[in-house]
Amino acid sequence: APCSRGSSWSADLDKCMDCASCAARPHSDFCLGCA
């Protein structure tokens, strides 16, 4: 299923990444889909 609004799929974690948590670390590969 696609990720919910405000989140993005992370191939590194095999789960949806909450983009709000990426604001503090935009340079993490986990956050690539939130850029």
């Epitope: 191939a11 590194d12 974690l13 095999d14 503090a24 670390r25 986990f30």
Partner: antibody, heavy 120, light 108 residues
Framework: EVQLLESGGGLVQPGGSLRLSCAAS????????MIWVRQAPGKGLEWVSY????????HYADSVKGRFTISRDNSKNTLYLQMNSLRAEDTAVYYC?????????????WGQGTLVTVSS | DIQMTQSPSSLSASVGDRVTITCRAS??????LNWYQQKPGKAPKLLIY???SLQSGVPSRFSGSGSGTDFTLTISSLQPEDFATYYC??????????FGQGTKVEIK
Amino acid sequence: EVQLLESGGGLVQPGGSLRLSCAASGFTFSPYPMIWVRQAPGKGLEWVSYISPSGGSTHYADSVKGRFTISRDNSKNTLYLQMNSLRAEDTAVYYCARGGDTYFDYFDYWGQGTLVTVSS
Amino acid sequence: DIQMTQSPSSLSASVGDRVTITCRASQSISGYLNWYQQKPGKAPKLLIYQASSLQSGVPSRFSGSGSGTDFTLTISSLQPEDFATYYCQQSYTSPFITFGQGTKVEIK
């Protein structure tokens, strides 16, 4: 009880190969990212490689890229590190560790380590 | 790459002393900083995660603070079992993580 048990270390000549294993028990292995970290004799900790829970995504330190391959078999609860073209500077204790937290922010369980010695 | 620099590299202290170890990042890492303890011949053990959260089972004499580039690990009253090497580690650039060079706490 969570346990990670490394094996496969030993003495190998420069240019040789080794395959390290890390057997996991006491937890459900498949949802967790895993890493390898090494420690040269008398030195600090160096991250080596990362693998996603499914094994579909991998990352490597520049020092081992193109020579080492990380993989996992979730059906066997085992993590691997294939080490090729070994160099003297690869001599170290190799640890596997489990990524903790929702977003892999720390490593909450470590194996006891296996020693790799590269020497002629 | 983000470099992590610990100070001091080693220190001598007595049982009961308050000990402070500093970790400085070469750029801001927000609060993505963890601390580990390692005893000779043993694997590292997680003490503090996300700068200030105490890992389950770790004694409350250990505490962490800081944000941005400067972080501190404090042992409020050093115990005999605390003599070890301590490492900081940043996860800001996960999965590409880096460790500090370590701080060895020795008996005075």
